[in-house]
């Protein structure tokens, strides 16, 4: 069964910077990745970035840069411009649309006790959905 993993990492050098890493474990080719925050895509979440393997990547503030790390994993850098850090308690979700499997989504967040530079474990929150 395909699986999506999500890691949220606070940058050690800049406490206002976070990076979300997501990956797809499974056969098939990825046709689109959507990164949302505040919940899953279509269920209260707000899209922050869309990545297509050949058409390119797009992101919207507070996301700074979305990029493909490998053919099956992506990263999204976020810049927290506010004085407080809303990212610390936020859920980030990655939805991978793949052929022929369909869509698979998983969510993750930074653990409350995280020190800078440490990342959330790559265990997906159990919102794995196949559309």
């Amino acid at each position: 069964t395909p699986e999506v993993w999500v890691q949220v990492q606070m940058e050690a050098t800049e406490l206002s910077s976070f990076t979300v890493h997501c990956g797809f474990l499974g056969p098939g080719s990825i046709s689109l990745v959507t990164v949302s925050w505040g919940g899953p895509d279509g269920a209260g979440g707000t899209k922050l970035a869309v990545l297509h393997p050949e058409l390119g990547t797009r992101q919207w503030a507070p996301a700074r840069q979305a990029r493909w790390e490998t053919q099956s994993s992506i990263s999204l850098a976020l810049e927290d411009s506010g004085a407080s850090s809303p990212f610390a308690n936020t859920t980030f979700c990655c939805k991978f649309a793949s052929f022929p499997e369909g869509s698979w989504e998983s969510c993750g967040s930074l653990p409350p006790s995280s020190d800078p530079g440490l990342s959330a474990p790559p265990t997906p929150v159990p919102i794995l959905r196949a559309d």
Epitope: V50, P53, G56, R58, A61, W68, E69, I74
Partner: antibody, heavy 114, light 113 residues
Framework: EVQLQQSGPEVVKPGASVKISCKAS????????INWVKQSHGKSLEWIGD????????NYNQKFKGKATLTVDKSSGTAFMGLRSLTSEDSAVYYC???????WGQGTSLTVSS | DIVMTQSPSSLSVSAGEKVTMSCKSS????????????LAWYQQKPGQPPKLLIY???TRESGVPDRFTGSGSGTDFTLTISSVQAEDLAVYYC?????????FGGGTRLEIK
């Protein structure tokens, strides 16, 4: 089938402002990230910016910052582009297109003339 | 900004001939992470909006005839029409889909003799 329907041609005076609309149909509106593109007469294409209908987030081509303002109305499934302080240089056909430019509106002709 | 330069600016050929047009970018459009080139080609017929033909430098959009072929990598790209038809009369644009602003080339106008 995705369709983008743009508002009709505009003829305005220099210094005025205008608002062009682009209504999306055929899918959930929040799936439509809308680009705006300028094509001056007989010239190439220029990307103006894009808007995320989920939260109204925008990205602009630096060249059009202060000239163009992109907004969305989720309830009607419509994206808008406002253009201000118009001059003859703004006379062009303006297109809306989906996120990866795979679907385009029919274009809106803007003529700035006194 | 990435500058896209197309050549020639226009060409005139007879139906059935093979046509090649070039597009060069001022910076590489290759994404090192997934080894994909973020370059697109569009066809714009008179009085119509542009139509996406090719993306990822070489992938044909659904419904595009297989006489259209995109190739190239990094900064040098080519659009080839293997056997030009009368309906291919149009201006062809390449576009940087790699980074904002998403710049277009100046276009190549294809005329049919």
């Amino acid at each position: 089938e995705v369709q983008l329907q743009q508002s009709g041609p505009e003829v305005v005076k220099p210094g005025a402002s205008v608002k062009i609309s682009c209504k999306a149909s055929g899918n959930t509106f929040t799936d439509y990230f809308i680009n705006w593109v300028k094509q001056s007469h007989g010239k190439s294409l220029e990307w103006i910016g894009d808007i995320n209908p989920d939260n109204g987030g925008t990205n602009y081509n630096q060249k059009f910052k202060g000239k163009a303002t992109l907004t969305v109305d989720k309830s009607s499934g419509t994206a808008f582009m406002g253009l201000r302080s118009l001059t003859s240089e703004d006379s062009a056909v303006y297109y809306c297109a989906t996120l990866y430019f795979d679907y385009w509106g029919q274009g809106t002709s803007l003529t700035v003339s006194s | 900004d990435i500058v896209m330069t197309q050549s020639p600016s226009s060409l005139s050929v007879s139906a059935g001939e093979k046509v090649t047009m070039s597009c060069k970018s001022s910076q590489s459009l290759l994404n090192s992470g997934n080894q994909k080139n973020y370059l697109a080609w569009y066809q714009q017929k008179p009085g119509q909006p542009p139509k996406l033909l090719i993306y990822g430098a070489s992938t044909r959009e659904s419904g595009v005839p297989d006489r259209f072929t995109g190739s190239g990598s990094g900064t040098d790209f080519t659009l080839t029409i293997s056997s030009v038809q009368a309906e291919d009369l149009a201006v062809y644009y390449c576009q940087n889909a790699h980074s904002s602003p998403y710049t277009f080339g100046g276009g190549t106008r294809l005329e049919i003799k």
